[in-house]
């Protein structure tokens, strides 16, 4: 029986050109984490394997950095980075747990709180 829960950073609204940290935390289970995959839509961004360490997909190498912890740092954000990101925890013996984070990347002119709903 899977008793664990995934807690995430929560959804994030960020500014174009900036950087953000995506993090998930698995709690309420004693299962062993064997691997964590980070994906966006159908693309694999990175893998953190308990034995082999980190692997960043070649197409993201210049903008994605491992950590902190099992999290992922996205740098030089573009509007195209807007979307849903998944942290997929492979555990033994529980199986797979998935967390979801939606990242919204705004043009810098509308990324300030006061301007968010003023510019059509």
């Amino acid at each position: 029986m899977m008793t664990g829960t995934i807690e995430t950073t929560g959804n994030i609204s960020a500014e174009k050109g900036g950087s953000i940290i995506l993090q998930c935390h698995l709690s309420s289970t004693t299962a062993q984490v064997t691997q964590v995959n980070w994906e966006q839509q159908d693309q694999l961004l990175a893998i953190c394997n308990a034995d082999l360490g980190w692997h960043i997909s070649p197409s993201f190498k210049d903008r994605v950095a491992p950590g902190p912890g099992l999290g992922l740092t996205l740098q030089s954000l573009t509007v195209n980075d807007t979307g849903e990101y998944f942290c997929i925890y492979h555990t033994y013996p529980d199986g797979t747990y998935t967390g979801r984070i939606f990242l919204e990347v705004l043009e810098s002119s509308v990324a300030e709180h006061g301007a968010r709903f003023q510019i059509p």
Partner: antibody, heavy 117, light 112 residues
Framework: EVQLQQSGPELVKPGASMKISCKAS????????MNWVKQSHGKNLEWIGL????????SYNQRFMGKATLTVDKSSNTAYMELLSLTSEDSAVYYC??????????WGQGTSVTVSS | DVVVTQTPLSLPVSFGDQVSISCRSS???????????LSWYLHKPGQSPQLLIY???NRFSGVPDRFSGSGSGTDFTLKISTIKPEDLGMYYC?????????FGGGTKLEIK
């Protein structure tokens, strides 16, 4: 002026599929996420999912996975929601709504869907 | 999923009253950057829902200042300082911090 114009009411048979449209005007269509919301029988609101027209990225409420499919046509500034294998439980008013910073600032007028044989 | 509980379900009022609507979530709505994506909507009969408040306390363009939002973490409040006829309808809160977004069950503001 920001406007979201939805397609008209639909009466469909159980088991059929249908597509609702939401034509956006008065703003940069690709710069905002478009959400879809269900309201059953004048009761609670339920978030179905969203699509970001710029790159076509989607996010769904798991409850509607396999029931709703979200797409956009950037050339006509139109968002679509296809509803599959309709049952009486899908009878509702469906809204499209633009969002930024995870709040829905402009809403379409709603599309009433009735599933009946 | 985050459960959002709104109280009361129904709120009988007289014009000129001041009222508060409460919205509580099953987990914190503040993300790791300190942003809280909690918004309030009014749904009048025969109309589409309209945004009143976003980000806990920011009034949307054109919303009268008799509407105000407050709160933090898991506990939020919408206050209407002087009820007018056009304020009657269903009020909903929405959390957009966690996937999937979830609405409160609604509060019906009606005349006594």
């Amino acid at each position: 002026e920001v406007q979201l114009q939805q397609s008209g009411p639909e009466l469909v048979k159980p088991g059929a599929s249908m597509k609702i449209s939401c034509k956006a005007s008065g703003y940069s269509f690709t710069g905002y996420t478009m959400n879809w919301v269900k309201q059953s029988h004048g009761k609670n609101l339920e978030w179905i999912g969203l699509i970001f027209p710029y790159n076509g990225g989607t996010s769904y409420n798991q409850r509607f996975m396999g029931k709703a499919t979200l797409t956009v046509d950037k050339s006509s500034n139109t968002a679509y929601m296809e509803l599959l294998s309709l049952t009486s439980e899908d009878s509702a008013v469906y809204y499209c709504a633009r969002s930024r910073s995870f709040a829905m600032d402009y809403w379409g007028q709603g599309t009433s869907v009735t599933v009946s044989s | 999923d985050v459960v959002v509980t709104q109280t009361p379900l129904s709120l009988p009022v007289s014009f000129g009253d001041q009222v508060s609507i409460s919205c509580r979530s099953s987990q914190s709505l503040t993300n790791s950057y300190g942003d809280t994506y909690l918004s309030w909507y009014l749904h009048k009969p025969g109309q589409s829902p309209q945004l009143l408040i976003y980000g806990i306390s920011n009034r949307f363009s054109g919303v009268p200042d008799r509407f105000s939002g407050s709160g933090s973490g898991t506990d939020f409040t919408l206050k209407i300082s002087t009820i007018k006829p056009e304020d009657l309808g269903m009020y909903y809160c929405l959390q957009g911090t966690h996937q999937p977004w979830t609405f409160g069950g609604g509060t019906k503001l009606e005349i006594k």
